[in-house]
């Protein structure tokens, strides 16, 4: 009878081990061990046992101990198990953001590992077991589905291998994946809202707000806001799920023309745009043209109103015929039309809005000076002894200096408060004199004797 | 569609003058600014000039100030470029090409027309 | 000089992704453009914007910007696609309205 001691043993890959091989009879012909495995015969005294070390057990193996004696022959098995941790458990890669409300799949792939009896593989979220498996195939797969909550948002999903060799009295071996931490996200499929100046003129500031609600987590999102090829700077706020994006634009020359104004968030792996036109206008205020600001009574005037090719004006309220960027008006220049204002306002569609510009000149009529009844009487008839004011008011542009003369000497205090003298009687000679000329005329003052009675 | 065809170019002598055109069609001209941009054979483009859409502000590259000048005539959807006092170094394939903005990129472009300044 | 700086030269094996770079500090201001010139032919807009292709550009043609460079990136790279590459961009220095990268000669293996 031949025997095996252990008869089962469970080691770890590359180990070795002691196997004792031992027969009935005492004289035996033959005592062995039949095994691929490395093998050193350790010597002990007598024939009827011998202990073989086996090493480098890299697979399960069933050596057999084997014994001729004068009764027979026979043989004995004995079990060796090998275990060993898997050589790799990783998680199938994922894109780290992951929009809320979707079905995302775990899958945790285990290569090696035995044996595969005690092998189990575990997907976790946290702490949290998600699914527990058994290993099987190679490499062994195990799969789940999460649907995607914001409060996953940060999670870490990991895999785990338990090798369970309690039952054997060893211990448990746990291997982990690296672990792949969920970013969730909400991006809402409303675009943002873009609020901005449809139309902008060149040299000019204008303000664009671009804002969106029912983001998560609204701190990751980014904002991209774009005028033509120009990057905005935006201040941006942010609330508890939205933003707002502020940002100023400053206009030149430069951006003359239509411009798309973009307002792009990205959150995740997702974005979403907006686009509005902006047009950039250069419109500067129309010229109004005087042939001379300044011109002397009877001259004829030329007054031309110019605006920008595509404006329409109207001058002093008259559209320009054909209607047009030019308006023009022809008068012979009145004491009337001295201070008068020729006013020039001119119109320029741009993308459907009306812009208006004016510009106003005045004209300067050069006339007089001038004497006249109304405003200077020739005659005057005054109590002795009364107060009176004489008024002679001389007309003309520029304004005439004005003098009245009794006998070339004596002067007429106008516009000054008197009391009236007989020296005050006589004829004065008002004299009104400017740069276009002087004018002259009698004024005759009366005075009155008071009656005694 | 859009298309945009340089003409005028030519053989000149240095200090010689020449008038490029470039005929627009298939946009709204008159609200699209435009632009010249060069390149000497076998070597890159060069922006050199370009004009906003009402004819009212004009830029030029340092190498042409002085001696080109671009204008536009939005009745007849025409692109101009005058250009004098002309050097060797002037010698390019002219495309002209247009913008929705002065400062803008480039939508679309001419098949170029060769000015060659030699003696 | 040229105030935007590309490689002379890169070549791509058909089918795979290749990046073209352009450097220059107005492109920290402004995007840049992208036009593509096959021999004998006029520039072609291929980006504009952060990432915008005209109509009838592949989508394999994108666009992207960090700091003051700006990519042009062909993923799946075709025959066709050899050609010059020249970025473009505003003049933030203002010498200029519009200033051009030197080009890049794309060879498809």
């Known amino acids: 009878q031949t025997s095996v001691s252990p008869s089962k043993v469970i080691l770890p890959r590359g180990g070795s081990v002691l196997v004792t091989c031992s027969t009935s009879c005492d004289q035996p012909k033959l005592l062995g061990i039949e095994t691929p495995l490395p093998k050193k015969e350790l010597l002990l005294p007598g024939n009827n046992r011998k202990v073989y070390e086996l090493s480098n057990v890299q697979e399960d193996s069933q050596p057999m101990c084997y014994s001729n004696c004068p009764d027979g022959q026979s043989t004995a098995k004995t079990f060796l198990t090998v275990y060993w941790t898997p050589e790799r458990v990783e998680l199938a890669p994922l894109p780290s953001w992951q929009p809320v409300g979707k079905n995302l799949t775990l899958r945790c792939q285990v290569e090696g590992g035995a044996p595969r009896a005690n092998l189990t593989v575990v997907l976790l979220r946290g702490e949290k077991e998600l699914k527990r498996e058994p290993a099987v195939g190679e490499p062994a797969e195990v799969t789940t589905t999460v649907l995607v909550r914001r409060d996953h948002h940060g999670a870490n999903f990991s895999c785990r291998t338990e090798l369970d060799l309690r039952p054997q009295g060893l211990e448990l071996f746990e291997n982990t994946s690296a672990p792949y931490q969920l970013q969730t996200f909400v991006l809402p499929a409303t675009p943002p809202q873009l609020v901005s100046p449809r139309v902008l003129e060149v040299d000019t500031q204008g303000t664009v707000v671009c804002s969106l609600d029912g983001l998560f987590p609204v701190s990751e999102a980014q904002v991209h806001l774009a005028l033509g090829d120009q990057r905005l700077n935006p201040t941006v706020t942010y609330g508890n799920d939205s933003f707002s994006a502020k940002a100023s634009v400053s206009v030149t020359a430069e951006d003359e023309g239509t411009q798309r104004l973009t307002c792009a968030v990205i959150l995740g792996n997702q974005s979403q745009e907006t686009l509005q036109t902006v047009t950039i206008y250069s419109f500067p205020a129309p010229n109004v043209i005087l042939t001379k600001p300044e011109v002397s009574e009877g001259t004829e005037v030329t007054v031309k109103c110019e605006a920008h090719p595509r404006a329409k004006v109207t001058l002093n309220g008259v559209p320009a015929q054909p209607l047009g960027p030019r308006a023009q008006l022809l008068l012979k220049a009145t004491p009337e039309d001295n201070g008068r204002s020729f006013s020039c306002s001119a119109t320029l569609e741009v993308a459907g809005q009306l812009i208006h510009k004016n510009q106003t000149r005045e004209l300067r009529v050069l006339y007089g000076p001038r004497l006249d009844e109304r405003d200077c009487p020739g005659n005057w008839t005054w109590p002795e002894n009364s107060q009176q004011t004489p008024m002679c008011q001389a007309w003309g542009n520029p304004l005439p200096e004005l003098k009245c003369l009794k006998d070339g000497t004596f002067p007429l205090p106008i516009g000054e408060s008197v009391t009236v003298t007989r020296d005050l009687e006589g004829t004065y000679l008002c004299r009104a004199r400017s740069t276009q000329g002087e004018v002259t005329r009698k004024v005759t003052v009366n005075v009155l004797s008071p009656r005694y009675e | 569609q859009v298309q945009l065809q340089e003409s005028g170019g030519g053989l000149v002598q240095p200090g010689g003058s020449l008038r490029l055109s470039c005929a627009a069609s298939?946009?709204?001209?008159?609200?699209?600014?435009m632009s010249w941009v060069r390149q000497a054979p076998g070597k890159g483009l060069e922006w050199v000039s370009a004009?906003?859409?009402?004819?009212?502000?004009?830029y030029y590259a340092d190498s042409v100030k002085g001696r080109f000048t671009i204008s536009r005539d939005n009745s007849k959807n025409t692109l101009y470029l005058q250009m004098s006092s002309l050097r060797a170094e002037d010698t390019a394939f002219y495309y002209c090409?247009?913008?929705?903005?002065?400062?803008?990129?480039?939508?679309?472009w001419g098949h170029g027309t060769l000015v060659t300044v030699s003696s | 000089a040229s105030e935007l700086t590309q490689d002379p030269a890169v070549s791509v094996a058909l089918g795979q992704t290749v990046k073209i770079t352009c450097q220059g500090d107005?492109?920290?201001?402004?995007?840049a453009s992208w036009y593509q010139q096959r021999p004998g032919q006029a520039p072609v807009l291929v980006i504009y914007?952060?990432?915008s292709r005209p109509s009838g550009i592949p989508d394999r043609f994108s666009g992207s910007s960090s700091g003051n460079t700006a990519s042009l990136t062909i993923t799946g790279a075709q025959a066709e696609d050899e050609a010059d590459y020249y970025c473009?961009?505003?003049?933030?220095?203002?010498?200029?309205?519009?200033?051009f990268g030197g080009g890049t000669k794309l060879t498809v293996l």
């Open positions: 914007g952060e990432n």
């Open positions: 473009n961009s505003r003049d933030s220095s203002g010498n200029h309205l519009r200033v």
């Open positions: 298939g946009f709204t001209f008159s609200s699209y600014a």
């Open positions: 107005s492109l920290r201001t402004y995007y």
């Open positions: 004009i906003s859409g009402s004819g009212g502000s004009t």
């Open positions: 090409a247009n913008s929705a903005y002065t400062g803008g990129w480039y939508d679309y």
